[in-house]
Structure formats: C-alpha cells, structure tokens
C-alpha cells in the first residue's frame, strides 16, 4: 500500500490526522466496526488540543471514542498507552458502574455534552468519531 497523503472526501484534516464525524448513532461495537471498515479507528485523544478540536466538531451530543475497558484495564483501540496518556474524565468518572447487570461495568468511553468523558454501557446509540493518521500506509493500491 501507499502512504496516505490527504484525507478522504468528507473527512476533516487536523494535525496530520483525518477525522470523520458521524451524524447517526450506533452502539460502541458497531461504531468501532464502522471505523475499521474505513481503514480507521475510533478517535484516540492524545492531547488537550485534540480534545478541543473534536469537541468543537461534535457539539453537545454524547459521542463514542476509541477507549474501552471491556477486557479489564482501560485501553485505546490503537494501542496508545492509557496510563501515561491524556485524560479528560468528568469528576468521579470513570466509575465503571457495575449496577447495570450486564456482566461487567460501564465499559465504553464517550464525550459528554460538555466534552468531558464518561464511561457508559456500550449498547447506547451515540454518535462516534473515526480517525486515521495521514502518515500511515493505506490499504488502497497506489494511484498510477
């Protein structure tokens, strides 16, 4: 494959990444799959600057990001280290609330209406953001 040098149509470029902002709502797993099919991943927030950029585009609507703890510890979908990385949780979050009886806690993270993060049950029909890096190899064949 070739290196992607510009963003696909309807994606927004920012700091060498491309972002796609959904309008519809999906469960976290469906949103995750959607991004993967686009050769991308759910957004991984690595800085306050990126947080502000995403927040500006999504507005006051709950929106999934690429952070979950479905297998135990919190993990970013692209492997970015959670412990040392940027975080913007709401106060008292994540509470990984186990009361819902789904066999685990609230396992998926989303931007709330004020942009700060909350963990929630993963079946909620929230919007989502896909991200892909411009410098990574594309799955598409090079243009001749």
């Amino acid at each position: 494959g070739s290196e992607r040098t510009c963003c696909p149509v309807n994606w927004v470029e920012h700091e060498r990444s491309c972002y796609w902002f959904s309008r519809s709502g999906k469960a976290w797993a469906d949103a995750d799959n959607y991004c993967r099919l686009e050769d991308a991943h759910l957004v991984v927030v690595t800085s306050w600057e990126e947080q502000k950029f995403v927040q500006h585009h999504i507005g006051p609507v709950n929106t999934w990001m690429g952070l979950h703890d479905q297998n135990g510890p919190w993990k970013w979908v692209d492997g970015t280290d959670y412990e040392t990385g940027f975080k913007n949780w709401r106060p008292e979050q994540p509470d990984d609330w186990y009361g819902h009886g789904l066999g685990g806690g609230e396992d998926c993270a989303h931007f709330t209406d004020d942009g700060r993060w909350n963990d929630d049950v993963c079946q909620r029909p929230y919007r989502w953001v896909c991200e892909t890096e411009l410098d990574k190899a594309s799955q598409e064949p090079p243009l001749l």
Epitope: S24, G25, N62, W97, H100, L102, V121, R124, Y126
Partner: antibody, heavy 120, light 107 residues
C-alpha cells in the same frame, strides 16, 4: 409551561394515508429529541418512532418501518408523523412526547393524544 | 429486541398500602429504565427516569430501584389519586420498549 398538542387524527380507510402534527410551546424545541407513542384501544403503550433534536436521525418500531415517517420543523416548533399504507392495527391514540435530551434519553413530557381509526 | 415484562399485571390495594411493581428486561439495560403512570382517557405521566431518579414535581412517595434486568417501582403509601396503570419503559437503545403495564385498583 411546557406543552405538546397533537392534531390530525381521524377516520381513514385501510391503505390510505394520514399526517399527524404536534405543536410545541414553552421550551426550546430545537434542543430536544421527539417521539411518537401509540396506544390501541384497551391496550398498552407502544413506542413508534423518534427523531433527534436536529433531525439528523430517526428510528422506528419494526411494525411501522417503511410505512411511517417522522419529521420536524424546528423553525415552526412542530413534529409530524406521516402514516402511509395504514392498517386496522394502526388504530390507536397517538401521543407525541419530548425526549429528555437529544433523542436517546427517554420521555418526559407528553401531549394529550390524537385518535386515529383505520376502518373501511 | 429486548422484551420487558411486568408483574403483577394487576393488583388490588387499599389507601395507605405500600405497593411494589416489578419490571424485568430480557437482557441488561443498565440504568436506562423509566416508569409512567396513566389514568383512563389521559396521557401518560413521567414518574421515574434512570431507574431511580424522581421526575420533577412527582411526590416522593414514588421511588424506583434496580439496574440491569430487574427494576422496582414502589408507592410508599397509596392515595386515591394513585389508582392507575403503571408502565415501565427501557431506553438503553432503540426500540424504546414498554412493559405491558400494571393496573392498580381498589381492593
């Protein structure tokens, strides 16, 4: 105060169409998702459809999918339900209801309902 | 789709009684459950949301509890105005299914 008023109900023959409206007042309509819920005579409540605050998303019960269309006009603070290919089992009181937020947080305020009767 | 069941389907009670209605989801729905009251010929009225949060203006004799699959609505001391049908509704994801209702009438 917050108010929802439905209109447009009536008697209609099977296979025909009808359009219900819901006028809102007392709150900022464009900030809230809106729902339709129906209740057949002597029966329980059935959720019909939702439209998000900005009209970007709509979702339907399987029983009405492909026949009913929910829409909104935020400039006029009105919600609509276009009902096509009506069947006898669509006979019900139809309520519009406000979502607690943009469209995924449940229902808080309800209208008084409008009656639809599908009969030949 | 997730199914909602309520029990009992009807109950007879007296003024002053403590009344408990249960709602069960066929799969976990988190805290995303609401309770509504409906009187004959009237629109439903919201009582409880997020399983246990009291709707503004609703008296504190109404309370909700539970999470996941099992939920309860309790009326601590039944008053004449409380004789009605009560519905639960899930709103974790679409469709927002209602339970079949519980009718509370005079003993």
């Amino acid at each position: 105060q917050v108010q929802l008023v439905e209109s447009g109900g009536g008697v209609v023959q099977p296979g025909r169409s009808l359009r219900l409206s819901c006028a809102s007042s007392g709150f900022t309509f464009r900030n809230y998702g809106m729902h339709w819920v129906r209740q057949a005579p002597g029966k329980g409540l059935k959720w019909v459809a939702v439209i998000w605050f900005d009209g970007s998303n709509d979702y339907y019960a399987d029983s009405v999918k492909g026949r009913f269309t929910i829409s909104r006009d935020n400039s006029k603070n009105t919600l609509s339900l276009q009902m096509n290919s009506l069947r006898a089992e669509d006979t019900a009181v139809y309520y519009c209801a406000r979502d607690r937020s943009v469209g995924y947080d449940g229902l808080d305020v309800w209208g008084q309902g409008t009656t639809v009767t599908v009969s030949s | 789709d997730i199914q909602m069941t309520q029990s009992p389907s009807s109950l007879s009670a007296s003024v002053g009684d403590r009344v408990t209605i249960t709602c069960r989801a066929s799969q976990g729905i988190g805290k995303y459950l609401a309770w509504f009251q409906q009187k004959p010929g009237k629109a439903p009225k919201s009582l409880i949301y997020a399983a246990s949060s009291l709707q503004s203006g609703v008296p504190s004799k109404f309370s909700g509890s539970g999470s996941g699959t099992d939920f309860t609505l309790t009326i601590s001391s039944l008053q004449p105005d409380d004789f009605a049908t009560y519905y639960c509704q899930r709103y974790d994801t679409y469709p927002f299914t209602f339970g079949p209702g519980t009718k509370v009438d005079f003993k």
